[in-house]
């Protein structure tokens, strides 16, 4: 798979492959994988990809199921790259506060908050 | 501050305090703090709170500015709790795939993806 495929297209294709291979993937009925108990997905990327690793090691490879796991690995690479960009730019306090304000604003309006 | 205050109310109050104390917080003109370069805030919580720590250590404490940093510390505690819940529940593959599908769906529709 060319790594040049836009990430947005990669995610769409992966969703389709996930549907296609669902039956094969759930073949192991005894396997248990950690599942986050909330919907703030970005907080759980590490655990999600650990789960994907567990699933891959238990899945018979071949055909387009390999493409699914390759795609998921590229998505992980993208997310790791985004995480690296969390601390790259050193800015004045005012700009940090604008970012913090936006973060709290998004937390206020978009996060699923259980008290 | 009672830690029993609902997190959503805590976030709202913190946004207000951030506005109130902005002038005091930006008093150090030469201080530089890492600012994430994308809007996927949840990926960057660690760096955001490191930045808050840097800011707190450089800010003259007293009055309600202390309450601001106390609030931010409680928000961090909430997020750390959410992170702990990422791997607590072990579930069947089918359930993990449902979560993965939802994660990719959200990534597809809500994330700001720069290729």
């Amino acid at each position: 798979i060319p790594t040049e495929i836009p990430t947005s297209a990669l995610v769409k294709e992966t969703l389709a492959l996930l549907s296609t291979h669902r039956t094969l993937l759930i073949a192991n009925e005894t396997l248990r994988i950690p599942v986050p108990v909330h919907k703030n997905h970005q907080l759980c990327t590490e655990e999600i990809f650990q789960g994907i690793g567990t699933l891959e090691s238990q899945t018979v490879q071949g055909g387009t199921v390999e493409r699914l796991f390759k795609n998921l690995s590229l998505i992980k690479k993208y997310i790791d790259g985004q995480k690296k960009k969390c601390g790259e730019e050193r800015r004045r306090v005012n700009q940090f506060l604008d970012y913090l304000q936006e973060f709290l604003g998004v937390m206020n309006t978009e996060w699923i908050i259980e008290s | 501050i009672p830690t029993e205050i609902p997190t959503s109310a805590l976030v709202k109050e913190t946004l207000a305090l951030l506005s109130t104390h902005r002038t005091l917080l930006i008093a150090n003109e030469t201080l530089r703090i890492p600012v994430p370069v994308h809007k996927n805030h949840q990926l960057c919580t660690e760096e955001i709170f490191q930045g808050i720590g840097t800011l707190e250590s450089q800010t003259v404490q007293g009055g309600t500015v202390e309450r601001l940093f106390k609030n931010l510390s409680l928000i961090k505690k909430y997020i750390d709790g959410q992170k702990k819940k990422c791997g607590e529940e072990r579930r069947r593959v089918n359930q993990f795939l449902d979560y993965l599908q939802e994660f990719l769906g959200v990534m597809n529709t809500e994330w700001i993806i720069e290729s």
Epitope: R92, Q95, D98, E102 | A27, E29, V37, H38
Partner: antibody
């Protein structure tokens, strides 16, 4: 490499509103490390900062122009815009858009706007 | 609001040292940025944070800042250095940007 390009009319009538758009390429306007700014330069004079905006919509304006200036951002188009109302001949200048981190990193080539009837 | 004062012009012979000043109340407590602008072109940063040079800017360009004056120094001046030079600071706590009026550097001869 981030590139910026100003666009808009080169001639505006007195008392009307000057409108310019800056299109950002080679980078995202949602980059949290940057503000997006407008600067102008009157013929033969120094640089004058007009204002800047954060992707979240926070704005900062030059106090001397604040009553007439509006800067907005459209993250979906990777653009930000300047509106300057009630213009006079004194607003004739080259208008630059620029990215602003700790300093002005990247600039557009500038566009001359003349205010004349 | 904060005011930065620059001399309108500075003249220097090739090979000599040019010093361009930027005056402001207690400017030494602020970070100063210097831009070079040639006719018909957009400005280019030559010094940031008082004395740091961006990559691609010759070592001949240096800066200093203390008290009420910041200085851009160009050693071994070349004809190609002829341009307008502007200083810039952030005005706290408003976080407004302030530019000096600009200095025209003329290289004689």
């Amino acid at each position: 490499q981030v590139q910026l390009q100003e666009s808009g009319p080169g001639l505006v009538k007195p008392s009307q509103t000057l409108s310019l758009t800056c299109t950002v390429s080679g980078g995202s306007i949602s980059n949290g490390g940057y503000y997006w700014s407008w600067i102008r330069q009157h013929p033969g004079k120094g640089l004058e900062w007009i204002g800047y905006i954060y992707y979240s919509g926070s704005t900062y304006y030059n106090p001397s122009l604040k009553s007439r200036v509006t800067i907005s951002v459209d993250t979906s188009k990777n653009q930000f815009s300047l509106k300057l109302s009630s213009v006079t001949a004194a607003d004739t200048a080259v208008y630059y858009c620029a990215s602003l981190g700790n300093w002005f990193d990247y600039w557009g080539q500038g566009t001359l706007v003349t205010v004349s009837s | 609001s904060y005011v930065l004062t620059q001399p309108p012009s500075v003249s220097v012979a090739p090979g000599q040292t040019a010093r361009i000043t930027c005056g402001g109340n207690n400017i030494g407590s602020k970070n100063v940025y210097w831009y070079q602008q040639k006719p018909g072109q957009a400005p280019v940063l030559v010094v940031h944070d008082d004395s740091d040079r961006p990559s691609g800017i010759p070592e001949r360009f240096s800066g200093s800042n203390s008290g009420n004056t910041a200085t851009l120094t160009i050693s071994r001046v070349e004809v190609g250095d002829e341009a307008d030079y502007s200083c810039q600071v952030w005005d706290s706590p408003s976080d407004h940007v302030v530019f000096g009026g600009g200095t025209k550097l003329t290289v004689l001869g």
